[in-house]
Interface confidence: low
């Protein structure tokens, strides 16, 4: 992988038609910020600016709208929004930031309301969306930022909203909240400091008695020449219900660490981007993936990981030694005094002592950090988004895989195989103006990933098992998602019947899986072609045999008959061999890709001239053949030009 | 569906060596999602943890055992083994080997008889 | 070091709730699991993380805690309920697994 990261094995430029994709836009809209499936996985609900969508994205192809409302902001507060000298072009309006299902009946949605955020239920019939009333639009302060470009999180648990944003106009008041349901509003207390002013929340994920907050702030815990910013996971436990006397309508539970990003002797990726839960059948085997910046361009590029973080290690360093302020210094060292009881955090059920609340008002943050395991550092790309599900290979075996999208409109699709680094299966340029992807959806149902831009929402197929025409390229290919189906002879996704299916996630080694035909009958370390592409020569014409470079992990060379080519002596123009008819100029020339320890050929040529034609090698004998038209340079004569020609007699 | 077997010679010699093997099948013992781990149960009494393997082969095992105890895995096997040397009587028990963090599933247990 | 109480016996006639506890200092901030063993067989999991159920276990099992108190509730007893009952969680000083004594369950 080198010091870049994994590469993309394969790489689609945007308007590729080798990758099935489908766009949806709709005149009018931008900022398809907020996406929700439906809970039957049939429906996308998108918040836009100053819109709710319902999409039906039932059928492959182009996800269709089924209906959609209008939320705007008021015209007194784009009015008033303007006069605070905020832009009515690109500030002063309704974005949805948050987007949830409140129950069978019922979304709620939240948006920035021209700074002024704003809260509503939102009421569904047969999965449409039925109109807001101006009535019911509640205070939305603390639910959704004020402004559109400041981060944000909120998650539904129990009929509770959790919510991290900003919680003023200005931008430097950051809060984490509960609201909604039958137990008492809480937030985070200003004037305690347990939140830096610049905090950045960017997920939310609940857990069997808390409700963990990811973000980044400034750190105050360490002397540093430079402002150094800190990833942090923070906890609140569900059942608090705030202090009687201290701390009404606080949270009592509130506890912050530092989340660890970093392989081993070098700086840290210490900006947090976007965080996910991938549940395991217990939830403390359970991991939180997450994707990580760095406020240091090593390189003068930027560089991204991903790092996981089991649920288990959070839990231990939020059980764990508590820093605390000194005073006189302030400096933060590891608390050594006497525990109290309940222990801040523990989400003990009983009303908590004063001395307890006292206790827990200064000592918020942890002493150790939690270490995640880099499963993925790539330099030259920044991600800002991540999905990610287990995908069951052919044997059974689980792996993770990863949708991670980039601040240049792209997406990769990375697979962790058990206990190793993560390698890239495909990128993906969907947006041909590269500008960012805001959101990703994975909608498991259709076997899909969507993702949000200012102008439209993508459908990705999560795999592109067809565009792997051989099964050697299939097998190299690594993706979980497909395997090679011998009968068919076809790249498949893979489905419930797919016994003698080939597949190979733990090697990715076509030597053990495609061996079939020739190979059964002796095992070389090189395929036989699939098809022989006939080529004549012409007279007085340079011959360019064309070399498609399927993957970017193979190295290629080009040989004639048995004998390697060498480069030295070999006119390669962007991976074509360039030849000029003459004596021995005939026979088999192949194109050969090496990945993976194995060689196999892309493409086969037999050039044979008009008046010397070359018997074909038995050894080939059965091998399909058809007769192409290649690129020809016509030399001699003074004159030089490059044409298609047709060399076949009509 | 992850399924558990113990296997091992289900008679020892006080002072030998006890070997049982447990055979995963169905999961991965490479996993890193999980530790495997060996647990005991005298005839009439209740669980006793002895250790726990994790997927990086770092072990971890009960303080009242460690000095007679070694569990190892065999990644390409898909197999965890369980040896307990200098064993006495008191090493009589029904002997499991379970997934965890929760211990869920159990292996059916194979009784191993510490007598000369 | 942790430890575990639980009474060794709990009697409960056929449809009524038993209620098997477990006490340990500070339980109620610690993920507790409960297992069932029946006679010859080896133990199976009922309630992990304190009151969360894996799939195949009824929903009459359910696990609560209070501060220094777990509790495996069995409602509307059954008598293939008949069983020992372990609880168990992990210490949270030395990362490693506690088992109480267990308590056995008779269905009259």
């Known amino acids: 992988t080198g010091g870049q990261g994994p590469m993309p094995r394969v790489k689609y430029h945007a308007g590729d038609g080798h990758r099935a994709l489908s766009f949806f836009q709709q005149k009018g809209l931008r900022d398809f910020d907020t996406l929700l499936l439906s809970d039957d996985g049939n429906t996308l609900y998108v918040g836009a600016r100053e819109a709710v969508l319902a999409l039906n994205i039932q059928n492959p192809g182009i996800p269709r709208l089924k209906n959609m409302i209008p939320w705007p902001a008021s015209e007194r507060k784009k009015t008033e929004c303007a006069f605070k000298k905020k832009s009515n072009e690109t500030q002063c309006f309704n974005f949805i930031r948050v987007l949830v299902s409140y129950n069978a009946t019922h979304l709620y949605a939240c948006g920035t309301f021209a700074f002024s955020p704003a809260c509503t239920f939102i009421e569904l019939q047969d999965s449409l969306l039925l109109p807001i009333l101006i009535d019911k639009v509640m205070d939305g302060k603390g639910q959704s930022p004020f402004d559109p470009v400041h981060k944000h999180t909120a998650v539904l648990v129990d009929g509770m909203l959790y919510s991290g944003t900003m919680n003023n106009f200005l931008g430097s008041e950051p809060i984490l909240m509960r609201t909604l349901g039958s137990q008492p509003v809480l937030k985070t207390d200003i004037f305690l400091r347990w939140l830096h002013a610049d905090a950045s929340f960017v997920a939310a994920i609940p857990s069997t008695q808390v409700v963990y907050f990811f973000f980044e702030e400034t750190a105050s815990e360490f002397d540093f020449f430079e402002e150094l910013y800190i990833s942090r996971v923070a906890q609140v436990c569900k059942n608090d219900v705030g202090g009687e006397k201290l701390l009404q309508k606080k949270w009592t539970t509130f506890l912050k660490a530092q989340l660890l990003c970093a392989q081993p002797g070098q700086l840290p990726f210490n900006i947090i981007r976007h965080a996910v839960l991938l549940p395991a059948d217990s939830p403390s085997v359970s991991r939180i993936y997450a994707v990580f910046t760095s406020q240091w361009q090593v390189g003068g590029t930027r560089s991204s990981a991903v790092c996981a973080f089991s649920l288990t290690d959070i839990e231990r360093v939020f059980k764990g030694k508590y820093k605390e302020l000194n005073k006189e210094t302030s400096r933060w060292t590891t608390y050594r005094g006497s525990e109290v009881s309940p222990r801040p955090g523990s989400c003990s059920m009983g009303p908590s002592s004063d001395k307890a609340l006292t206790f827990m008002k200064d000592h918020f943050l942890m002493d150790e950090h939690v270490v995640g395991t880099p499963l993925l550092v790539k330099s030259g790309v920044e991600y800002t988004r991540l999905a990610v599900e287990s995908a069951r290979g052919l044997d059974g075996s689980s792996h993770v895989v990863m949708y991670l999208g980039t601040s240049t409109g792209s997406l990769h699709k990375a697979v962790v195989p058990q206990d190793s680094s993560a390698y890239l299966v495909e990128e993906i340029q969907l947006s041909p103006d590269s500008e960012p992807v805001r959101n990703l959806q994975l909608a498991p149902a259709q076997g899909a990933v969507f993702a949000g831009f200012s102008g439209g929402i993508w459908r990705v197929p999560r795999a592109n098992c067809s565009v792997y025409e051989s099964c050697v390229d299939c097998v190299l290919a690594r993706d979980p998602h497909c395997a090679w189906d011998p009968e068919s002879r076809l790249c498949s996704l893979l489905s419930g019947s797919t016994k003698p299916w080939k597949q190979d996630m733990e090697r990715g080694n076509p030597e053990w899986v495609c061996t079939r035909g020739p190979m059964a009958r002796s095992p070389r370390r090189q395929s036989p072609p699939q098809l022989i592409k006939e080529v004549l020569t012409v007279p007085n014409s340079i011959l360019e045999l064309p070399c498609p470079h399927l993957s970017a992990l193979a190295s290629y060379h080009w040989s004639h008959g048995r004998a390697k080519i060498s480069e030295a002596s070999a006119t390669v123009y962007n991976g074509s061999l360039l030849l000029l008819p003459q004596d021995g100029v005939g026979g088999l020339y192949q194109c050969v890709a090496t990945e993976n320890g194995y060689s196999y050929p892309v493409v086969s040529y037999w050039v044979d001239s008009q008046d010397q034609p070359l018997a074909l090698d038995p050894e080939l004998a059965g091998v399909p053949r058809e007769r192409v038209q290649v690129p020809l340079t016509r030399v001699g004569g003074g004159a030089s030009m490059a044409a298609q020609r047709s060399y076949w007699p009509h | 569906q992850v399924q558990l077997q113990e296997s091992g010679p289900g008679l020892v010699k006080p002072s030998e060596t006890l070997s049982l093997t447990c055979t995963v099948s169905?999961?991965?013992?490479?996993?890193?999602?999980?530790?495997w781990s060996w647990i005991r149960q005298p005839p009439g009494k209740g669980l006793e943890w002895i250790g726990h393997?994790?997927?990086?082969?770092?072990?971890d095992y009960n303080p009242s055992l460690r000095s007679r105890v070694t569990i190892s895995a065999d990644k390409p096997k898909n197999q965890f083994s369980l040896k307990l040397n200098s064993v006495t009587a008191a090493d009589t028990a029904v002997y499991y080997c379970?997934?965890?963090?929760?211990?869920?599933?159990w292996g059916q247990g194979t009784m191993v008889t510490v007598s000369s | 070091q942790s430890v575990l109480t639980q009474p060794p016996s709990v009697s409960v006639a056929p449809g009524q709730t038993a209620s098997l506890t477990c006490g340990a200092n500070?339980?109620?901030?610690?993920?507790v699991q409960w297992y069932q063993q029946k006679p010859g067989q080896a133990p199976v999991l009922v309630v992990y993380?304190?009151?969360d159920r894996p799939s195949g276990i009824p929903d009459r099992f359910s696990g609560s805690s209070s501060e220094n108190t777990a509790t495996l509730t069995i409602s509307r007893v059954e008598a293939g309920d008949e069983a020992d009952y372990y609880c168990?969680?992990?210490?949270?000083?030395?990362?490693?697994?506690?088992f109480g004594g267990g308590t056995k369950v008779t269905v009259l």
């Open positions: 168990q969680l992990w210490d949270s000083v030395t990362d490693r697994p506690v």
């Open positions: 500070n339980i109620g901030s610690k993920s």
């Open positions: 169905g999961g991965s013992v490479s996993s890193g999602r999980y530790d």
């Open positions: 379970a997934r965890g963090p929760f211990f869920d599933p």
């Open positions: 393997i994790y997927y990086t082969g770092i072990t």
């Open positions: 993380d304190g009151s």
